[in-house]
């Protein structure tokens, strides 16, 4: 990747990622420097007859760093702080080639939950106020609510009226997704409204 257009690479929190390095064809490489946010990560001197010399210069990521046979960078047990700009400089006798990368770390979504604040009106219509959440949600998480294949909401919240006298059993499903995972959680309108009805009856007595 040229330094002007960094290659964007997705990594998953806790997993591994490889930043691929392409060599100049037919040229002898003198050394390779890997940088993270403009700070040296590693310095590699290839040898034709023996193993390359690898000098890891960043102790913070050092234990999680590895290099493939083609000196692509492998980073394991990814952390959020690994997000950022990576560069590889390949120096040959005649030139220096620069490859740029932007690594973003995405979380596998987990622990989807739905909270319910519903009301029962005098006419026995049940108004559902549902809120969906996942652990550590960020701006890259998309939420939506669906019922019978139709999207009823594109936000974590859903407000909907349900009348047991005219509506059949209805499930509402929250779907949370990002670029690397998706989760869903379904709730029954009938069940939620029955619970509200019990509370409503209890308070009336």
């Amino acid at each position: 990747q040229s330094s002007l257009t960094p290659l964007m690479v997705n990594g998953i929190l806790g997993e591994s990622v490889t930043l691929p390095l392409e060599f100049p064809a037919g040229e002898k490489v003198n050394f390779i420097t890997w940088l993270f946010n403009e700070t040296s990560l590693a310095f590699i001197v290839p040898h034709e007859t023996k193993s390359p010399e690898i000098h890891v210069t960043n102790p913070k990521q050092g234990k999680r760093l590895n290099f493939t046979q083609s000196y692509s960078l492998q980073l394991s047990n990814l952390k959020m702080e690994d997000t950022g700009s990576y560069r590889a400089q390949i120096s040959t006798k005649t030139s220096a080639k620069l490859s740029s990368y932007t690594l973003r770390i995405l979380r596998q979504l987990r622990n989807i939950q739905v909270t319910n604040h519903s009301q029962l009106f005098q006419n026995m219509t049940c108004e559902l106020h549902l809120t969906c959440s996942v652990e550590d949600a960020d701006d890259n998480v998309s939420f939506r609510w669906e019922a019978l294949g139709n999207t009823l909401s594109s936000q974590p919240n859903l407000t909907v009226s349900w009348d047991p006298r005219i509506s059949s059993e209805q499930d509402y499903t929250c779907i949370a997704e990002n670029a690397v995972s998706n989760l869903s959680f379904s709730v029954s309108a009938q069940k939620l409204c029955e619970d509200v009805k019990i509370q409503y009856t209890d308070t009336k007595m």
Partner: antibody, heavy 118, light 106 residues
């Protein structure tokens, strides 16, 4: 039917402010996020950010932090975009667009042209 | 941010011909949306989540792709298809649009 109707064209002087409205009808306003998209003359579409119509919480793209404010009046199902300290480069068509999920904009306003000129 | 590169910038074709346009993302995305825009009009939703046609979109349109490469195809151009088509990704904030492909009459 579902529609978004935006306020009319505006001609403003540099340094002034403008408030663009987007009135929604035909659906439950608080169930769908509202996005704002800018298209400068002869240019591509640029996503400015969105507002959660249930909580009222706005989110801005980096290029639109500072002078741009998204707001709501839920009682009249209307979203607003306010731009302060207008510059000539703010001259553009501004669109509101409903998010149907996965940031797919299934309904668009007709657009509001804002012209900034001295 | 994820950069979307659309190619070609302009497609000059005649009615009845097949049109294929590409949208390449600088990073892998889960799905791509497409919009059609005609001069002086707001964009219109065209293809949702890579391959689903929006309401009212004719079956001669199709979408495909995965990862970083996505394609919109028109099997046989009709006069009303001449317009600009934009791709848009949702996987990462900010949501970004491609630069558009203009399909013009040859």
């Amino acid at each position: 039917q579902i529609q978004l109707v935006q306020s009319g064209s505006e001609l403003k002087k540099p340094g002034a402010s403008v408030k663009v409205s987007c009135k929604a009808s035909g659906y439950t306003f608080t169930n769908y996020g509202m996005n704002w998209v800018r298209q400068a003359p002869g240019q591509d579409l640029k996503w400015m950010g969105w507002i959660n119509t249930y909580s009222g919480e706005p989110r801005y793209a980096d290029d639109f932090k500072g002078r741009f404010v998204f707001s709501l009046d839920k009682s009249v199902n209307t979203a607003y975009l306010q731009i302060s300290s207008l510059k000539a480069e703010d001259t553009a068509v501004y669109y509101c667009a409903r998010d149907y999920g996965r940031w797919y904009f299934d309904v668009w306003g007709q657009g509001t042209t804002v012209t900034v000129s001295s | 941010q994820i950069v979307l590169s659309q190619s070609p910038a302009t497609l000059s074709l005649s009615p009845g011909e097949r049109a294929t346009m590409s949208c390449r993302a600088s990073s892998s995305v889960s799905h791509m949306h497409w919009y059609q825009q005609k001069p002086g009009q707001a964009p219109r939703p065209w293809i949702y989540a890579t391959s689903n046609l929006a309401s009212g979109v004719p079956a001669r349109f199709s979408g495909s792709g995965s990862g970083t490469d996505y394609t919109l195809t028109i099997s046989s151009l009709e006069p009303e298809d001449f317009a600009v088509y934009y791709c848009q990704q949702w996987s990462s904030t900010p949501r970004t649009f491609g630069g558009g492909t203009k399909v013009e009459i040859k």
